[in-house]
């Protein structure tokens, strides 16, 4: 029972995590314009992995896709790759884990096969989570580096007379979604691996015992029976949770307004 619960919970947590990784990958707010200690601009810039957007105080938002592959920074390409690998591995892991679930019966699938599939999906979830965490962390590191570089020359003077507003970028919502989602996928993967141990069938070998009936010399040798650890025993109705996590990709047409100070 505990094994089923652990496996089911691992699946649901991973499902939510992977949905989060997909959401983070698609979100536009990986980096957002830093408003602290900056003139209050009537435009708000934010960038994602696939496009950059500008939200004007008029309420209009204009987004432009990165219509180039070669012209993009290598780090951005690496982050994209990590996130996509995470999603692909997570998706395969989900597919495998559906068939590995104890509460789902498929033909005459052996417990050992279910255990192997549970372990496989668990490892996939762990790698998927690590990919997402790594991708988000690489992007965050890139932001921190650029932030301090732009802070060093925040205002570039033109003979000390004209000031140029240097747009600095800080962590966007997608980074936090990515970290949390990656962590959930990782936890889900660990739970699946733990569940796998409980699912693994144990070989129960009974030693041959000789029974001597009076007057007869017949030896009965019972064959080695495999302990059927709960296969098909759980006939209760079980709910399979469809943990589809919906995340809203911040397309509000107006920035959170603060009075100009």
């Amino acid at each position: 029972m505990a094994v089923t619960a652990c496996q089911g919970l691992g699946f649901v947590v991973s499902l939510i995590g992977i949905a989060g990784i997909i959401a983070a990958t698609c979100m536009d707010q990986w980096s957002t314009q830093d408003l602290y200690n900056n003139p209050v601009t009537a435009v708000f810039n934010y960038q994602g992995l696939w496009r950059s957007c500008v939200r004007e105080s008029s309420g209009f938002t204009e987004c432009r896709g990165y219509f180039t592959l070669l012209g993009l920074p290598a780090m951005l390409q690496a982050v994209r790759a990590l996130m996509i690998v995470g999603i692909v591995l997570g998706a395969i892991g989900l597919l495998v884990s559906i068939f590995a679930l104890k509460c789902i019966r498929i033909g005459s699938m052996e417990d050992s096969a279910k255990a192997n599939m549970t372990l496989t999906s668990g490892i996939m979830f762990i790698v998927s989570g690590l990919c997402a965490i790594a991708g988000v962390s690489v992007f965050a590191n890139m932001l921190v580096t650029n932030f301090w570089m732009s802070t060093a020359n925040m205002y570039t003077g033109m003979g000390g007379m004209v000031q140029t507003v240097q747009t600095r970028y800080t962590f966007g919502a997608a980074l936090f979604v990515g970290w949390v989602a990656g962590g959930l996928t990782l936890i889900g993967g660990v739970m699946m691996c733990i569940a796998c141990r409980g699912l693994a069938p144990e070989e129960t070998n009974y030693k041959a015992v000789s029974y001597h009936a009076s007057g007869h010399s017949v030896a009965y040798k019972p064959g080695g029976f495999k302990a059927s650890t709960g296969f098909g025993s759980n006939t209760k109705n079980k709910k399979i949770y469809d943990g589809g996590a919906r995340t809203e990709d911040e397309v509000q047409s107006y920035p959170s307004k603060h009075d100009y100070v």
């Epitope: 950059s52 500008v54 008029s58 209009f60 107006y254 959170s256």
Partner: antibody, heavy 118, light 113 residues
Framework: EVQLQQSGPELVKPGASVKIACKAS????????MDWVKQSHGKSLEWIGN????????IYNQKFKGKATLTVDKSSSTAYMVLRSLTSEDNAVYYC???????????WGQGTSITVSS | DIVVTQSPSSLTVTPGEKVTMSCKSS????????????LSWYQQNPGQPPKLLIY???TRQSGVPDRFTGSGSGTDFTLTISSVQAEDLAGYYC?????????FGAGTKLELK
């Protein structure tokens, strides 16, 4: 056709308050924000502030903070500006205007003249 | 606040001639996020509200004759009227659309010679 119809001219006493209305028609009111601009007689234009017609969020020019209050009534597609503690400095024509791309003001009301006199 | 300076304050013209007026801001109005300059130009006739001519420094508002051209980047901007018509005799204002509070220039008045 987009139209911003403002309330008529007002003659008010010093220290009093006045409420200017700006009724929008010809477009979905909540899809656009509303800006307010002051023009003193024979002078240039001054930006007062901006209000989000959907959420009611505001941004004010520091100079007009405490002087002007912007509100909206979505049901009647009307934006309002209340000017308080009026003095002779507030004698001007006040415009409501709809911001468009680039934060530029593409449609303007006809203006409301405020005269402060005892 | 950003200071927007317009020059000249008034300009005497004859119909048909080319007119150029300048607008300078104390800070750059260029947004690196979308590579656009947040400056607009308005025309105002006496007793009338201003009318939008140009936004994003060089994009002509629909319905505005193509004799009106906006140019410039960063802090220096120009409005050019290729061939002035009688109906163009009015006041012209530029506006900083980039940094709050949004500020207007003092204006350039176009008068008949």
């Amino acid at each position: 056709e987009v139209q911003l119809q403002q309330s008529g001219p007002e003659l008010v006493k010093p220290g009093a308050s006045v409420k200017i209305a700006c009724k929008a028609s010809g477009y979905t009111f909540t899809d656009y924000n509303m800006d307010w601009v002051k023009q003193s007689h024979g002078k240039s234009l001054e930006w007062i502030g901006n209000i989000n017609s959907y959420y009611g969020g505001t941004i004010y020019n520091q100079k007009f903070k405490g002087k002007a209050t912007l509100t909206v009534d979505k049901s009647s597609s009307t934006a309002y500006m209340v000017l308080r503690s009026l003095t002779s400095e507030d004698n001007a024509v006040y415009y409501c205007a709809r911001p468009h791309l680039g934060n530029a003001l593409d449609y303007w009301g006809q203006g409301t003249s405020i005269t402060v006199s005892s | 606040d950003i200071v927007v300076t317009q020059s000249p304050s008034s300009l005497t013209v004859t119909p048909g001639e080319k007119v150029t007026m300048s607008c300078k801001s104390s800070q750059s109005l260029f947004n690196s996020g979308n590579q656009k300059n947040y400056l607009s130009w308005y025309q105002q006739n006496p007793g009338q509200p201003p009318k939008l001519l140009i936004y994003w420094a060089s994009t002509r508002q629909s319905g505005v004759p193509d004799r009106f051209t906006g140019s410039g980047s960063g802090t220096d901007f120009t409005l050019t009227i290729s061939s002035v018509q009688a109906e163009d005799l009015a006041g012209y204002y530029c506006q900083n659309d980039y940094i709050f509070p949004l500020t207007f220039g003092a204006g350039t008045k176009l008068e008949l010679k």
